[in-house]
């Protein structure tokens, strides 16, 4: 996360680190004792479940036990819109035990469409600079807002690449954004409860003023999530 402050896992108990061969690859969000929500592109290189592990319950990357993964379910790839459908569900081998530092985040209600300038939060262990060095060892957080998709698709920005199944978030002047290593983590909105409204997906650089972060819009995939759950009951 670029333009940030340190976070405590008490504040974001649904945040997990998704690791391959003990290396942090992506963030993710706990939805219930069995399921973690993340981005499909995290698994482009490796889809085998055996070397993937989930770490929950700590704000420090290396300091918490790893959980075995039973299944990785990725939505169908759409070659017409290769950046669309960047969503995946990980089923854990054993259910999580919830505590002060391990808790689920809510899915949005089906009519939750957020207006531009709505305040949101991002978190992650990703790079803190665009051309950036390394992952952060500690969980970082930042406040952003919904950026109007018309503005996001402007000629000096993403030129129409942001589809209706995506959303943009950042701050108008830039400087606050998700970055490499934050992928799969939640874009969060607080109403009565915290909701995961977006999944860290893609962007050009990190923190540029005209190219904010682009997120998978979770409300666009509720049906897919519910169908996966139903099929896995």
């Amino acid at each position: 996360v670029v333009g940030v402050e340190e976070a405590s896992v008490d504040s974001w108990p649904w945040q997990v680190s998704i690791q391959y061969d003990k290396q942090h690859v992506c963030g993710g969000s706990i939805l219930d004792p069995h399921w973690v929500l993340t981005a499909a592109h995290c698994f482009r290189k490796h889809t085998d479940v055996f070397n993937w592990k989930v770490r929950a319950g700590s704000d420090k990357l290396g300091s918490f036990p790893s959980l075995a993964v039973a299944k990785i379910i990725i939505i169908e790839f759409n070659p017409m819109y290769p950046k669309d459908n960047d969503i995946a569900l990980m089923k854990l081998q054993f259910p999580l035990t919830f505590s002060g530092t391990v808790r689920p985040i809510c899915l949005p209600f089906f009519d939750e469409e957020l207006t531009p300038a709505t305040p949101l939060w991002i978190i992650g262990w990703g790079f803190t600079k665009q051309n950036g060095g390394k992952m952060s060892d500690i969980l970082l957080q930042a406040s952003v807002q919904v950026i109007d998709s018309t503005r996001c698709n402007a000629d000096d920005a993403y030129q129409g690449e942001v589809t209706e199944k995506m959303m943009c978030a950042g701050i108008p002047e830039g400087g606050v954004d998700t970055c490499q290593g934050d992928s799969g983590g939640p874009l969060m909105y607080q109403s009565d409860q915290w909701h995961v409204v977006g999944i860290v997906s893609w962007g050009y650089g990190c923190g540029g003023p005209s190219t904010p972060g682009v997120y998978t819009k979770v409300s666009a995939y509720l049906n897919w999530i519910y169908n996966v759950w139903k099929a896995e009951l």
Epitope: P104, C106, L107, P108, F109, F110, D111, E112, E113, T115, E164, K165, S191, D192, Q193, H195, K217, S219, A220, Y221, L222, N223, W224, Y226
Partner: antibody, heavy 115, light 112 residues
Framework: QVQLVESGGGLVQPGGSLRLSCAAS????????MSWVRQAPGKGLEWVSA????????FYADSVKGRFTISRDNSKNMLYLQMNSLRAEDTAVYYC????????WGLGTTVTVSS | DIVMTQTPLSSPVTLGQPASISCRSS???????????LTWLQQRPGQPPRLLIY???KRFSGVPDRFSGSGAGTDFTLKISRVEAEDVGVYYC?????????FGGGTKVEIK
Amino acid sequence: QVQLVESGGGLVQPGGSLRLSCAASGFTFSSYAMSWVRQAPGKGLEWVSAITGSGGSTFYADSVKGRFTISRDNSKNMLYLQMNSLRAEDTAVYYCARGGNLDVWGLGTTVTVSS
Amino acid sequence: DIVMTQTPLSSPVTLGQPASISCRSSQSLVHSNGNTYLTWLQQRPGQPPRLLIYKISKRFSGVPDRFSGSGAGTDFTLKISRVEAEDVGVYYCMQLTQFPLTFGGGTKVEIK
């Protein structure tokens, strides 16, 4: 003012198809999920289908799954219901309704499936 | 699917008197986000339905304050404190917590 106007209803034979439209005005259409609800003659209300504001997620009642398709065109402020393989039991007044609370309704359009 | 059961089927009321309609769901309507998406709709004869109450007890804009909603979990009630002639029609409860969305069978309010 906020308004929903349905059209496209009519008489169709069993097995036939029909496409209903709902024109929305007076609000930011893309910010709202939309639903279709139907009411058979002399009967209660039955939810048919819903679609999220982006059009990304669609939901259906079991009675219409695989036969009906909900869609929307946010650039035109239009909601659609494509109805295929129509049956006599699909005969009803079809309403479109706004949002997760169904807070605005159209006047409805009548679909009659009969030979 | 969540089954919504309304009672009574019909409620003959004297003008100016209260009326009460009950709605019971086959499972809890509390969404994972903590909200309870239970709405009440009114359908006057020959008209489309109209939203009265959402999230158990919130009155929709323009709805007279003689209408009130209450309840929690699986048991909900719509009350009309003093029935007026324009209140005649069928009242439906509906849950929007879980797909498929489902309605109660309706309660007909008529004047004695």
